[in-house]
């Protein structure tokens, strides 16, 4: 289970039309459910029920986004429509280039994601917890456009913000 280095870049526009980027670094783990490779895309937060249906007639959202899914405590979600692995597969089917699970409330999901799969997804499936998950939640709560860059080696520069 290799460390996944995740950089989240927030884009904040100013009234003048310029924008500032804020980069936050956090770490997770690549799970065996997916590939250990780099990926990058705009963050799309997936509601637990938003991955349930499988309407073939529906258009794909678009390709190349990074899905973020918060998992609830198993006792508070006793009959999920899909397994954690199923949710990852559904997100990738719908165009995700990577999936990040917040497993803070559901650490059992780590084992589910790391069970040796005969057919792992060809995209990375990362899990985060604790302080890193809180960082991620705070970012998606800011309501700004954000991109996630997932790497399997540390980024070269320290995380900082800079003006464009």
């Amino acid at each position: 289970k290799e460390t996944a280095f995740v950089e989240v870049v927030l884009f904040e526009s100013s009234p003048s039309g310029d924008y500032t980027t804020y980069t936050t670094g956090l770490t997770g783990r690549f799970s065996r459910a997916g590939a250990t490779l780099s990926a990058e895309g705009e963050i799309v937060q997936m509601h637990p029920l938003g991955l349930c249906n499988n309407n073939d007639e529906e258009d794909l959202y678009e390709y190349g986004w990074v899905g973020v899914v918060k998992l609830e405590q198993p006792e508070l979600d006793p009959k999920p429509c899909l397994t954690v692995l199923g949710k990852a597969k559904r997100a990738v089917q719908r165009g995700a280039t990577a999936v990040i699970f917040d497993v803070s409330e559901n650490p059992e999901a780590i084992d589910q994601l790391n069970q040796g799969s005969e057919d792992p997804l060809k995209r990375p499936v990362v899990y985060v917890k604790g302080a890193d998950a809180i960082k991620l939640m705070n970012i998606v709560n800011k309501q700004k456009v954000a991109r996630a860059r997932i790497q399997h080696r540390p980024p070269r520069q320290p995380t900082e913000y800079f003006d464009m």
Epitope: I43, H47, N55, D59, L76, R94, G95, K144, V145
Partner: antibody, heavy 119, light 107 residues
């Protein structure tokens, strides 16, 4: 600040199609799911359907054959189309939003648009 | 589908009183219950979520409790501004069912 505002025709004839628009501002479709709820005159609230952050949809099974929800992210608009209208479809139609980080309630609602189905 | 049964449908109380509204789910909804207030001519507004968490800006006179299939909204020290219809709602499964509503009026 967060705003949702519904618009559409006030009067529609039976058997026709209703088209409503929800204009949103102050939040991103990437993080929020937009739902539609209606309220017949003097009655309670009925959930109609949702368009999720990923663009896929779910509908109230009772209305699924007649209902379609879509969106235009570039214009920050969500659309509701309900066909084969009956008089029982008369009511106030609301759009609202739900944060996608786990299970969350509807934290902001539009003001609603009154739709009357009558000949 | 899970049914939400709300009672009473109508409630009349005096200013300063405490009142309770109950919501019964046809199966265990694990605390995923919200309460909304709808004043005449307005859209509903979120009061309480996850059974007992108060939405930002809502007075502390409003409180929620319950578990399993039984849930309660309590309004303490009733104020004129509380005249409204109150709805419960489950929000962890389709079809996000609402209770039938409780209309509150001041005696």
């Amino acid at each position: 600040q967060v705003q949702l505002k519904e618009s559409g025709p006030g009067l529609v004839q039976p058997s026709q199609t209703l088209s409503l628009t929800c204009n949103v501002s102050g939040f991103s479709f990437n993080y929020y799911n937009v739902h539609w709820v209606r309220q017949p005159p003097g009655k309670g609230l009925e959930w109609l359907g949702v368009i999720w952050s990923g663009g896929n949809t779910d509908y109230n099974s009772a209305l699924k054959p007649r209902l379609r929800i879509s969106r235009d992210t570039s214009k920050s608009q969500v659309f509701l189309t309900l066909n084969s209208l009956q008089t029982e479809d008369t009511g106030i139609y609301y759009c609202n939003r739900m944060w996608g980080y786990g299970y969350n309630p509807f934290d902001y609602w539009g003001q609603g648009v009154m739709v009357t189905v009558s000949s | 589908d899970i049914q939400m049964t709300q009672s009473p449908s109508f409630l009349s109380a005096s200013l300063g009183n405490n009142i309770t509204i109950t919501c019964h789910a046809s199966q265990d909804i694990k605390g995923w219950l919200a309460w909304y207030q709808q004043k005449s001519g307005n859209a509903p507004e979120l009061l309480i979520y996850k059974t007992s968490s108060l939405q930002s800006g809502v007075p502390s006179r409003f409180s929620g409790s319950g578990s399993g299939t039984e849930y309660v909204l309590t309004i303490s020290n009733l104020q004129p501004d509380d005249i409204a219809t109150y709805y419960c709602q489950l929000y962890h499964s389709f079809p996000f069912t609402f209770g039938s509503g409780t209309k509150l009026e001041i005696k």
